[in-house]
C-alpha cells in the first residue's frame, strides 16, 4: 500500500545507501561504491536522483525501475 501523507515518516532508503530529502516529497539516493551487482530492490517511488556509480552492475533489464515515476 501507499505510505500515508506525513512530514515525520522517512521515505524508503535502500540498505547501505545514503539518502537525503529533496524538497517536500522527493529523495536523493546515493548507492555509489557499494559493490552492488544488481539494482537496490526497495527504491522509493519518490526517488528524484539515484547514484549507482562505482558498482558491479553489468547490465540492466528493460524498464529496470518500474516503481519510479
Amino acid at each position: 500500500g501507499s505510505s500515508p501523507r506525513s512530514g515525520v515518516l522517512l521515505r524508503g532508503c535502500p540498505t547501505h545507501c545514503h539518502c537525503e530529502p529533496d524538497g517536500r516529497m522527493l529523495l536523493r539516493v546515493d548507492c555509489s561504491d557499494l559493490g552492488l551487482s544488481e539494482l537496490p530492490s526497495n527504491l522509493s517511488v519518490f526517488t528524484s536522483y539515484l547514484d549507482l556509480s562505482m558498482n558491479n552492475i553489468s547490465q540492466l533489464l528493460p524498464n529496470p525501475l518500474p516503481s519510479l515515476r
Epitope: G7, V8, L9, L10, G12, C13, R24, N42
Partner: antibody, heavy 117, light 107 residues
C-alpha cells in the same frame, strides 16, 4: 535563522483545556510540517501529532485522538496545539518542531503544562 | 505501535572515550531512524537522519549505523559538549516513536 517561539508555562485544573502556541520565523511556514511532541517529567519523548500548514492536513497519535486539536494561522506563521479534558498525566513539557521528509530539524524551547487540582 | 528500546539508559564516560548507544526496534524499520541530542534548557538538536546521514553542522565524530531492527549511534572521541541525553526515533510508521533516552554523564 529558523526560530520556533512557544507560549509561556500554563497551570491548569483537571478537566480543563490548554492551548499552546508556536510562532515560526526564519523560513517559509507553509513549506514544512509542524510536529508536536511532549515529554513528561523524567520521561522520554512522545509524539502527539502533526499538521501541514499548507492546507491544515493533520495526523494524530491515536492515544490523543479526540482530545487534541492542531491548527495553524498562516497569516501570523503560528501553530497551535489544544489539549482538552486534561488529567494529571498530561503534566509535561510540550514541544513544537518543524519537519521535512521525515526528520525534525528545529525544535521550540518547550512549554511546561502543569495539571493540578 | 513500534517500540524502540534504547540502551544503556545511562552511561558514564570520560572526555576522549569512544561511546556507543544502541536502539532496537520491535520490528524492521528499514533504516528509517533518526538520532537527537537534548541538553537541559536547550532546544532538542537533530544529529543523524536516515540511520547514518549527519545533519549539517554536526561534528564528524558522530556516526550512525545499523539495519533491520538494530541501530547504533557512535561518538568516536567524546568532547565536553557531548554530555547530554540522546534519543533515537523511528520514522517508519505512524505514530513515530522514540527510545527512552540515554543520559551520557561525565565519569
Amino acid at each position: 535563522q529558523v526560530q520556533l517561539v512557544q507560549s509561556g508555562a500554563e497551570v491548569k485544573k483537571p478537566g480543563a483545556s490548554v492551548k499552546v502556541s508556536c510562532k515560526a520565523s526564519g523560513y517559509t511556514f507553509t513549506n514544512y510540517w509542524m510536529q508536536w511532541v511532549r515529554q513528561a517529567p523524567g520521561q522520554g519523548l512522545e509524539w502527539i501529532g502533526e499538521i501541514d500548514p499548507s492546507d491544515s492536513y493533520t495526523n494524530y497519535n491515536q492515544k490523543f485522538q479526540g482530545r487534541v486539536t492542531l491548527t495553524v494561522d498562516t497569516s501570523t506563521s503560528t501553530a497551535y496545539m489544544e489539549l482538552s479534558s486534561l488529567r494529571s498525566e498530561d503534566t509535561a513539557v510540550y514541544y513544537c518542531a518543524r519537519s521535512l521528509s521525515g526528520y525534525v530539524d528545529y525544535w521550540g524551547q518547550g512549554t511546561t503544562v502543569t495539571v493540578s487540582s | 505501535d513500534i517500540q524502540m528500546t534504547q540502551s544503556p539508559s545511562s552511561l558514564s564516560a570520560s572526555v576522549g572515550d569512544r561511546v556507543t548507544i544502541t536502539c532496537r526496534a520491535s520490528q524492521d524499520i528499514s533504516n528509517r531512524l533518526n538520532w537527537y541530542q537534548q541538553k537541559p534548557g536547550k532546544a532538542v538538536k537533530l544529529l543523524i537522519s536516515y540511520r547514518s546521514r549527519l545533519h549539517s553542522g554536526v561534528p564528524s565524530r558522530f556516526s550512525g549505523s545499523g539495519s533491520g531492527t538494530d541501530y547504533t549511534l557512535t561518538i568516536s572521541s567524546l568532547q565536553p559538549e557531548d554530555f547530554a541525553t540522546y534519543f533515537c526515533q523511528q520514522g517508519n510508521s505512524l505514530p513515530p516513536t522514540f527510545g527512552g533516552g540515554t543520559k551520557l554523564e561525565i565519569k
